[in-house]
């Protein structure tokens, strides 16, 4: 199967990806363009204009300038200048600012909490199954199987720390060797990058926002996939990670450390533990073939227990199992002995919602999955709206310049490395790469951070999560200390190796180009984002898992032809773009293949057929929600609801159906300014539009 042609041009022809860019008008010369220099090479920019939007409220015929879709949008200040406000207006503006900050922090708090609950939900739904993946004996001999198990388990439990801790306990109890654990850790690294990709899907409403957000999220995925693609074979051939980490571990003089500091968890735990609490040991026990754990619930019921060591009479299979002959006796049938038994007495129940419901894990998991996704989505929308209203004009300029500008020459190259350190530091503070990268995603979407800057921040996040793991390892008990430290170090050096591969030389920053390519496709065909998610995080790993279970001959028999076809297609694609004359005329493009094999258009038509009936009801629902939101936020009455209906409305406009209101994020003052109707500042007027 040939690649989709859209992958080929990540940015050369932006007009191809901008909806409604049908007629280009001459560019007004007086418009100043905000250039955005990042630590990546500059990209040629094509300027062109969109047709004006017509509205019953106001007619805006201001010529619109559209740059390269990857250039950051100009966040215009639509509010009234501070100097033009009266005292009442100034006070109101300050209070609005404080209010917005409180709201932003509040939504950010619930956003992080919902990520935590989402992880718990995934563990309840797929945790036991994930645990059973580990009990597969083929992991030892098949690194590829280890890799996909790492991916699948982390995707199912939505937590790389859970899958890593299972691996640690398996290594500590000799069920797994460090050599066999390394591919699983690599897989866990890939699996953890799904969270911010899911978060990016929440920004599907706005094409340009979604393009940036999705690319910003998938840059993490591509970095991890590419790192594994290179480093797994290297590790299998040389075992460099195992050797290096073993040398480091052996040079340590161990002392059990303090517990790894819980920083963000201190704030979020009091809330999340009221929702649900899980007994994480159950998944580890299943992974370690503990039959009794299979019937245990993951939902924690008793939070306060008293463990007492007591001497208990227990039956044993034979006299050989007796602690001593004098401490053995019979009841006539069974042999009994006295053993020290730890007796667990339940004292106090947990204080979460599900403690008294006695629902099956799957039911609790599904309930929490729905709720957490709704909260996550709601918080994300509100964060984006608040940031959209705050980050305008001067504030936006300052923030964008601070984040995206390089150090002066000759130290420009250092900027990215500082970003890596910032990413690592921030991740260390929030104790989760998922939380950090998920918080980064909407910022990329709304255009505060460029993908070129988000990339090193994400790489730093990968490092940050491993330093947390190293600290946790140093605090672990004696029996697991060595194995947990070695695995944490393997994780650390894997990420360092990945950064050395895909960051220092701008030419090697393939993840950025790949993510942009995927961002372009996903902006044009939004269903492709979900398709990508399913294929890369579920279908491919599950297929490899199935083939691995069938044995090496089957895996090689299927894998080699597939890899050969992929390499052939990539080589052909490279030749087509670089030196097409070398190829025969027929191979200079993909037209020799059926359309469905080299274009997403036919697939789009099929999917549209299926999703068509759901678009109208969904849109109505969106409108109602948006109207309520507008009432609560005090948006202008004429605001168009909602962005997710944009395409539908564009379709209606094309058919001559008038659309009644301007964009949701457009501010009424812009429209008035366009008509020269700016009124005197009023205390009731918004600071900046929400």
């Amino acid at each position: 199967m040939a690649p989709w042609p859209e992958l080929g041009d990540a940015q050369p022809n932006p007009s191809k990806y901008l909806e409604g860019a049908t007629s280009q008008q001459p560019i007004t010369p007086d418009k100043s363009k905000e250039t955005n220099k990042t630590d990546n090479t500059e990209v040629p920019v094509t300027k062109f204009e969109l047709l004006p939007t017509y509205s019953t409220a106001t007619l805006i015929e201001e010529p619109t300038e559209v740059d390269d879709p990857w250039n950051l949008p100009t966040l215009q200040d639509s509010g009234i200048k501070w100097s033009e406000r009266d005292a009442k207006g100034k006070i109101l503006c300050v209070f609005q600012g404080i209010g917005r900050l409180i709201l932003l922090l509040g939504f950010l708090y619930f956003f992080v909490c919902s990520l935590d609950v989402l992880s718990s939900a995934f563990q309840l739904v797929g945790g036991k199954m994930a645990g059973q993946f580990f009990s597969n004996s083929s992991i030892m001999s098949n690194p590829l199987l280890g890799l996909v198990i790492g991916v699948l388990v982390t995707v199912f439990v939505q937590s790389s720390s859970t899958s890593t801790s299972i691996v640690v306990s398996m290594v500590a109890s000799s069920l797994l060797t460090v050599r066999a654990a390394i591919p699983i850790i690599m897989g866990a690294n890939i699996g953890t990058s799904i969270t911010n990709t899911i978060v990016a899907l929440m920004q599907v409403g706005d094409r340009s926002e979604f393009r940036r957000a999705f690319a910003g999220a998938t840059v993490h995925d591509f970095f991890n996939w590419l790192s594994v693609l290179v480093l797994l074979p290297v590790e299998v051939a040389t075992h460099y990670l195992e050797v290096v980490t073993q040398l480091i571990v052996e040079s340590f003089h161990f002392k059990n450390g303090e517990d790894a500091p819980d920083l963000l968890k201190v704030i979020t735990k009091p809330f999340t533990k009221l929702i649900v609490q899980l007994d994480k040991k159950v998944i580890s026990q299943i992974a370690m073939n503990d039959e009794t754990a299979k019937n245990k619930s993951l939902v924690k019921i008793w939070c306060k227990t008293f463990t007492n060591m007591t001497q208990m009479n227990v039956t044993v299979p034979s006299m050989a199992n007796c602690t001593s002959p004098s401490l053995c006796w019979t009841d006539g049938i069974q042999i009994w002995t006295m053993k020290n038994v730890t007796y667990k007495e339940n004292i106090a129940k947990c204080q979460h919602i599900f403690v008294n419901f006695h629902l099956p894990d799957l039911a609790v998991g599904i309930i929490l999955l729905i709720i957490s996704l709704l909260v996550l989505c709601g918080c994300l929308i509100m964060i984006v709206k608040i940031l959209g209203s705050v980050l305008k004009g001067q504030v936006a300029t300052v923030i964008k310049k601070t984040i995206n500008t390089d150090f002066p020459f000759p130290f420009a190259w250092l900027t990215g490395y500082l970003a890596i350190l910032v990413g690592a530091g921030m991740t260390f503070i929030v104790q989760s790469s998922s939380v950090f990268t998920s918080a980064l995603t909407p910022l990329i979407g709304i255009g505060v951070i460029t993908i070129e800057r988000a990339y090193p921040l994400t790489l730093g996040s990968n490092i940050g999560t491993t330093t947390t793991a190293i600290l946790a390892a140093l605090a672990s008990p004696g029996n697991t200390l060595r194995s947990s430290l070695q695995i944490a170090l393997c994780h650390f050096f894997f990420n360092i190796s990945g950064i050395l591969l895909w960051y220092p030389i701008p030419f090697t920053r393939l993840p950025i180009r790949m993510a942009k390519g995927l961002g372009n496709i996903s902006a044009k065909y939004r269903w492709f984002a979900i398709f990508y998610l399913i294929i890369f995080f579920f279908l491919i790993p599950l297929t490899v898992f199935g083939l691995s279970l069938a044995g090496w001959p089957v895996l090689v028999g299927v894998g080699v032809p597939v890899v050969f076809i992929i390499i052939l297609v990539l080589c052909l694609r490279l030749l087509q773009s670089r030196c097409p004359r070398v190829l025969p005329k027929k191979l200079q493009n993909w037209n020799f293949l059926p359309l469905c094999m080299h274009s997403l258009k036919p697939w789009d038509a099929v999917i549209s057929k299926f999703t068509g009936p759901f678009q109208m009801p969904c849109c109505c629902c969106c409108r109602v929600c948006c109207r309520v939101c507008c009432l609560l936020c005090g948006c202008p009455k004429c605001c168009r609801c909602s962005k997710c209906c944009q395409d539908l409305e564009e379709g209606q406009e094309a058919q001559g159906v008038p659309v009644k209101a301007p964009e949701t994020f457009d501010n009424i003052t812009i429209s008035r300014e366009a008509q020269g109707e700016v009124r005197a500042p009023d205390s009731k007027t918004e600071c900046t539009a929400l």
Epitope: W329, D331, I333
Partner: antibody
């Protein structure tokens, strides 16, 4: 209160078989072992074997293996012992006794079943 | 099989006397020993288990001691109803075995 009531005395011919019962009440039949003990006239006590009514698991004194068969009926809370191929030395009083949970002491005993083997 | 040897086999005593019966095991049985009292024509009755623990309803004048291979049953002050045959039993291993018995008679 705990009671163990055994079946009446038996007089049997050599080579024949006898099946005696031990009906229990006052406790959960399936939780304790049921032991059987032989006492020949003017002699001491001799352990024959035990049964755990909960699972039907049995253990026998090697001396009686093949001659004694222990069974239990949970529905009637009754234990049975069948003695086969009887000889004159099998003449004795046979007691059923409840085993204390977790060890081999016998806390409650039946009144005994007298078996006389005579031609 | 573990053999239990009781001594004496016969014992004559008067009401109010302090009486001690000994039971020796052929190998270490820990404390897995019980003592029974049997009156003529009656079923045995449990007195002591775990070598020293008195069974419910057994008068305090009966006490047991010992561990390993030597055990004793002591009646601190003989009562008229105490004249009977006494058996020790081990339950350290199968088969369970009893001592040959000690017959306590009125002097």
């Amino acid at each position: 209160q705990v009671q163990l009531v055994q079946s009446g005395a038996e007089v049997v011919k050599p080579g024949a078989s006898v099946k005696m019962s031990c009906k229990t009440s006052g406790y959960t039949f399936t939780t304790n072992n049921m032991h059987w003990v032989k006492q020949a006239p003017g002699q001491g006590l001799e352990w024959i074997g035990a049964i755990y009514p909960g699972s039907g698991a049995t253990a026998y004194n090697q001396k009686f293996k093949g001659r004694a068969t222990l069974t239990a009926d949970k529905s009637t809370s009754t234990a049975y012992m069948e003695l086969s191929s009887l000889r004159s030395e099998a003449t004795a009083v046979y007691y059923c006794a409840r085993g204390m949970y977790g060890h081999g002491a016998m806390d409650y005993w039946g009144q005994g079943t007298s078996v006389t083997v005579s031609s | 099989d573990i053999q239990l040897t009781q001594s004496p086999s016969f014992l004559s005593a008067s009401v109010g006397d302090r009486v001690t019966i000994t039971c020796k095991a052929s190998q270490d049985v820990g404390t897995a020993v019980a003592w029974y009292q049997q009156k003529p024509g009656k079923a045995p009755k449990l007195l002591i288990y775990w070598a020293t623990t008195r069974h419910s309803g057994v008068p305090s004048r009966f006490s047991g001691s010992g561990s390993g291979t030597e055990f004793t049953l002591t009646i601190s002050s003989l009562q008229p109803e105490d004249f009977a045959t006494y058996y020790c039993q081990q339950y350290s291993s199968n088969p369970l075995t009893f001592g040959q018995g000690t017959k306590l008679e009125i002097k």
